[in-house]
Structure formats: structure tokens, C-alpha cells
Amino acid sequence: MKVLQEPTCVSDYMSISTCEWKMNGPTNCSTELRLLYQLVFLLSEAHTCIPENNGGAGCVCHLLMDDVVSADNYTLDLWAGQQLLWKGSFKPSEHVKPRAPGNLTVHTNVSDTLLLTWSNPYPPDNYLYNHLTYAVNIWSENDPADFRIYNVTYLEPSLRIAASTLKSGISYRARVRAWAQCYNTTWSEWSPSTKWHNSYREPFEQH
């Protein structure tokens, strides 16, 4: 039994880091493998993660962490019974993938303006809470070419757009994702999408 693709890990910078790797053949990850991880610090504790299958030869493990600070560094040991298959380390602050925003809502009751709001996925006491910026993706269900991205570079989790920038009488979908420049994070996953019917009053034209 050998590791074909070494574990790579990302942290949500809150409580979970996710590590993925591939074995050289079909593996029952949860019965055959264990990933041990330990904070490199005084009187730290070794933890065991039981991996799950992620495709035939792929494994994924969700490492629980009480808290994360930028200096944290973890040792990782991948075991198959008594055999050490791989040894490495992981610094969560250098591999951050934020949690996805939630509760995306489209408010259409403001005249001719669409207000999109969503929730910051972090509690106020988390470092990333005040450092997230967002990308909002809006697309038409009827027209694949009608696809746009709005970058929200301010902290407020909301976006206002004129309803007239979209076609009237058509159903649209929106989703949102987040990243944090301070830790040069990857983008989060997209939030679940939300759907609405775009309709607005055409401006009255005088001839």
C-alpha cells in the first residue's frame, strides 16, 4: 500500500482543516488508514482522524482544531496499521479556504433595485470576519450567455444593483463566494444559489 498523491490540506481558519490524498489503488480509507495530527507546541496532544473515501483510491479527512492562530504548525503522519506511509506538516494560516457564505436572499421589494444580502460565515470573534470580500455570480436560467460576476470589495455582505441591468420577465439565479486577501486564501465554495423572477417597470417614454 502506497501513497500516490501526497496529502494536501486547507483550513477554514476556524475549526476544521480538510486533507485529501490518493492511494495507489482502491482503498477502504476508514478501515485501513489513520491520519495523526499534532500541534507543534509545548504539551500539545496527538489527535487521530479517521478518513473517508473520496472516489476509489481517494481519501479525505476532516481535522478538528479548537482554534487557529497564524503561527500554528501541525505534524501529519499517515498510518496504515503499524506502517508509516507518509510524514509531513501543515500550517493552516498558509492554506486557508474560507467557509462559504450562507443565507443568500434577493430582496425585490425596493423599487427598481435589487438588494442581495448574505451572511458572513464567521463569528465576529474570528479573524476572518472583518477580512472577507465577496464575488456575486448572477446568471439567467434562460440564456447561458447572460452570466455576470460582481466583486464586492467592501466588508458589508450585500450588493445593490439596478433591476434594469438585468432583463425583465426572466428568472435569474445568484450565488456568492468569499476570499480574504490578508491570508491570500483560495476562494470559498459557492453558496447555495437562490432564484427570483426579475420584473421592473420600463421607464415611460415621452414622444
Partner: antibody, heavy 119, light 107 residues
Amino acid sequence: QVQLQQSGAELVKPGASVKMSCKASVNTFAGYNMHWVKQTPGQGLEWIGGLHPGNGDTSYNQKFKGKATLTADKSSNTAYMQLSSLTSEDSAVYYCALTTAGRAWFAYWGQGTLVTVSA
Amino acid sequence: DIQMIQSTSSLSASLGDRVTISCRASQDISNYLNWYQQKPDGTVKLLIYYTSRLHSGVPSRFSGSGSGTDYSLTISNLEQEDIATYFCQQGNTLPWTFGGGTKLEIK
């Protein structure tokens, strides 16, 4: 809410030993470290050392090696510190303080145990 | 051992004031700087850990900042219950060490 309950004040003679306790109201004592801190008017706060109750690992401030011995009873979530060969220099308030395992900040503190060394 | 210097041993301020307490380390402590509050009855509480992280249950008027060797604790709107002695502590290098404390009093 985590609470640490320390044993009561001690009046001891020079040369004697004293053992104080600190009981933690936590679910799994093994996930924490228990540290001890000395406070005197002259020296202020001094870190004595820490213990991982789960595996018994300890770390001591060199200054207190041979003076303090840290132990724990996992079954009762209680940590102990024994101080030996006491002198007047050991008269102080001793605090137990809890950290999450492997952390360098004392998240919860006991109320302190006053030790007075006097003939 | 790393020396932690709180150059101001006592400080007087009025209720509602913005108060800043400083702490200097004798060498770089890589943000492993924590702040504690000790009330007159001896009760000790963690306020800020790792330079700027607010411990759970601590009012948001407390904040921390700094890097390298220089760190500070700020109370943005002083309240009566904040009357206490404040200690800094480094957790970067063994043995962990504390500052001498800054006693905060009301004018």
C-alpha cells in the same frame, strides 16, 4: 462555563512540604493542560510549569525544578502541585490555570491558594 | 529568560476614557502576547490572547495590538468594573514570563 476550584490556604513550617489541588469542571480533562503560577508582591507572577493530564507530560520553569512536582488524577479532573523543602521564599499565592492542550494562554484561572511558610 | 516590561505601574483615568496599557518584551515574541485582568479580590481573567484575539465573554471595549517586541491593550470606554491590575504574558519562549502589572485607578 469552565471553573477551577483550588484547595484552601495552608500554614506550613520551614522544611516541610505542601500539596495543593485544583479541580476542573470540564468534560474531558485530557484535552487541556494545567499550569501553575506563583504570585508574590516582590516577584509578581511567575510561571511554575504545566502538565498534560492525558499523557502525564510535564514542562517546568527551570527555577522551580526540584521545588514543584505536578501530577493529575484524570478520573476526578483534579491536578495537584506539591512544593517541597519550603522556605519563607515560597510564601505566595499559587494559581492553577487551564489552557487548551498545546496553547500558551491561560484561559481559565483558579481562585488561588495562599501558602504561608512560618515557624 | 524574556523580560516583559510594563513601564507604567499605575494609571489614573476617568470613566468613559480611552485607556492604553503598554508592554515591551526584551526580544521578539512573535505575537504570543496575552493580557490578563486581576481584580482586587485576586480573581484573574484572560482578556486577549495572541496579541489581538478577544477571549470568549470579554466585552468588545477591550482590544489588543502590537508585533515584534511592542504590544498594547486598549480599553475604549472605561467602566467602573474595569478597575483592576492588568498583566501581559509572553508564551513564545520558555519559561513563559509575565509583566509586572499596571494598576488602573479612577481619577
